[in-house]
Amino acid sequence: GSERTCCPVNWVEHERSCYWFSRSGKAWADADNYCRLEDAHLVVVTSWEEQKFVQHHIGPVNTWMGLHDQNGPWKWVDGTDYETGFKNWRPEQPDDWYGHGLGGGEDCAHFTDDGRWNDDVCQRPYRWVCETELDKASQEPPLL
């Protein structure tokens, strides 16, 4: 079933979540779907501490996260509230830039080479990070 008490093989545990770091690139939608089929979601960054953890593992490489505004407002893929939540945009970002010549603006968020966030064309083949939460029941310390 989907109830998890420990991370799958090749996933990294951190603060009761499990993370998987890709080494290839996909468009945002394909990365999003890849995570779903692993019973996970594209990483949702909720704190500076989580930001630093992810940044440490991905290095200076453009990497998709689970944040997009394809339907208007910015949304995290797991429903975490964007407006009140953690943000780490680069200065002047997001800018929904249309000057790339690829059609449309920029609707998907990624970590840049310095870890701060940028919005970019969702079709770009960037690396990605999947995240899945461990169950609350498994967070309780064992009875002695």
Epitope: G1, S2, E3, N33, C35, R36, L37, D39, A40, H41, W76, V77, D78, G79, T80, T132, D135
Partner: antibody
Framework: EVQLLESGGGLVQPGGSLRLSCAAS????????MSWVRQAPGKGLEWDSA????????YYADSVKGRFTISRDNSKNTLYLQMNSLRAEDTAVYYC??????????????WGQGTLVTVSS | DIQMTQSPSSLSASVGDRVTITCRAS??????LAWYQQKPGKVPKLLIY???TLQSGVPSRFSGSGSGTDFTLTISSLQPEDVATYYC?????????FGPGTKVDIK
């Protein structure tokens, strides 16, 4: 034992609204995505919508997008389908189905008995 | 969207026969395919997922194979209780589309 019990079906006029409910028991409801799947009389299965375990993300078939809204109340172990602007072609038995994953693998290991929705004037 | 087709739409076979149902996706879906059995007047039951993994409690006479666009459900020795409609379903991405079904009965 996993149990899914749908309710809320009935006769409604075209353009009308209906809210279906699915009461779940026998498993940790919030740990699983859920879907609604319909079956018109004498026809095959048609997936309508899905919602992930924490309720934070939804998926819809094009045929219901903008008309139907899936939601859940994990404190009540209940799944909902709000159906607006109903059409004759929405007439079907509506099943709620339990996904095998939290973030919606998209296939279903338990199904309710279904509730019949009839759209007719 | 990806379309799912099944063949045949119906078949009759004798008890003990080997029965094969095929499912085809209009585009590749890797092995993200499930099979369901729906007996008359009953709710669907999951038989197989990831194309070939048998769901717990499903008799071993059922098996699945295939990848990409072409998939097969096989009943190695048809039993009277296997009279049902069988549906394939793709779940590689939403929408999670079902095939039109194959009705199986006994000669």
């Amino acid at each position: 034992e996993v149990q899914l019990l749908e309710s809320g079906g009935g006769l409604v006029q075209p353009g009308g609204s209906l809210r279906l409910s699915c009461a779940a028991s026998g498993f940790t409801f919030s740990s699983y995505a859920m879907s609604w799947v319909r079956q018109a009389p004498g026809k095959g299965l048609e997936w309508d919508s899905a919602i992930i375990g924490n309720g934070g993300r939804t998926y819809y078939a094009d045929s219901v997008k903008g008309r139907f809204t899936i939601s859940r109340d994990n404190s009540k172990n209940t799944l909902y389908l709000q159906m607006n602007s109903l059409r004759a072609e929405d007439t079907a038995v509506y099943y709620c189905a339990k996904d095998m994953g939290r973030y919606s693998y998209g296939f279903f290991d338990y199904w309710g008995q279904g509730t019949l929705v009839t759209v007719s004037s | 969207d990806i379309q799912m087709t099944q063949s045949p739409s119906s078949l009759s076979a004798s008890v003990g026969d080997r029965v094969t149902i095929t499912c085809r996706a209009s585009q590749g879906i890797s092995n993200y395919l499930a099979w369901y059995q729906q007996k008359p007047g009953k709710v669907p039951k999951l038989l197989i997922y990831v194309a070939s993994t048998l769901q717990s409690g499903v008799p071993s006479r059922f098996s699945g194979s295939g990848s990409g666009t072409d998939f097969t459900l096989t009943i190695s020795s048809l039993q009277p209780e296997d009279v049902a409609t069988y549906y394939c379903q793709k779940y590689n991405s939403a929408p999670f589309t079902f095939g039109p079904g194959t009705k199986v009965d006994i000669k």
